[in-house]
């Protein structure tokens, strides 16, 4: 779970060790603040749960790519 310290800065201290199916993901945001110990991705699932993930992992990068393409593709 992401942890907000002195909001609005949100940091991730641990990453999920489970690969999440892209079908369960709704969006993501990048954590890049130097107030955080590490850069991270926070995925928001379709049930609005937020999960910290390691941006160095291939499945995380692939999921971000998928979501970015999906976001830009107009829904018909």
């Amino acid at each position: 779970q992401p942890d907000a310290i002195n909001a609005p800065v949100t940091c991730c201290y641990n990453f999920t060790n489970r690969k999440i199916s892209v079908q369960r993901l709704a969006s993501y945001r990048r954590i890049t603040s130097s107030k955080c110990p590490k850069e991270a991705v926070i995925f928001k699932t379709i049930v609005a749960k937020e999960i910290c993930a390691d941006p160095k992992q291939k499945w995380v990068q692939d999921s971000m790519d998928h979501l970015d393409k999906q976001t830009q593709t107009p829904k018909t």
Partner: antibody
Amino acid sequence: QVQLVQSGAEVKKPGSSVKVSCKASGLTISHTYMHWVRQAPGQGLEWMGRIDPDNHNTKFDPKFQGRVTITADTSTSTAYMELSSLRSEDTAVYYCARGVFGFFEHWGQGTTVTVSS
Amino acid sequence: DIQMTQSPSSLSASVGDRVTITCKAFEDIYNRRAWYQQKPGKAPKLLIHGATSLEHGVPSRFSGSGSGTDYTLTISSLQPEDFATYYCQQFWSAPYTFGGGTKVEIK
């Protein structure tokens, strides 16, 4: 406070090599990627490559492949960039930068490398 | 490589002016672009990354927009400290590439 401090200016002969260092403080380099970007006098920015200090995996612009070596020492939080077979066109300011996503939040102060006979 | 074409290469403006810089990618980069400001003799400074993420400490007069291949940096009311060179960069795929830069000068 994240800081990237680079080694000093270098003057090199054509055909030789140069090695530039970049010491990080305020972050654990194994958590990020360390990149190298150069800028020739009066010119734009050019990405050269990056290293994942955690596993030493590297990625380069094909333009520099075979001529550039990027290494990192996590024990000293230092990244290095070595460029070989120097030519006059390599005269530039060389910057290290950090960022796991491919954009660069923090930059070193730059190291001027002059290649001249 | 994804080529980034930035325009104009230079512009003259006055304090208080609204300034727009454009960047065109040669293929879709899905909002994965960043904007940097660089002053003479200094390292570039990250202003914006991704769709709308303004870096911490960057004034709100800076904004980014666009999608697909076309992106814009807008400075809503130019301040004296904004005279500098601005670069766009794509981070959709390596090798990461920069636009040629836009020098914003005092009119």
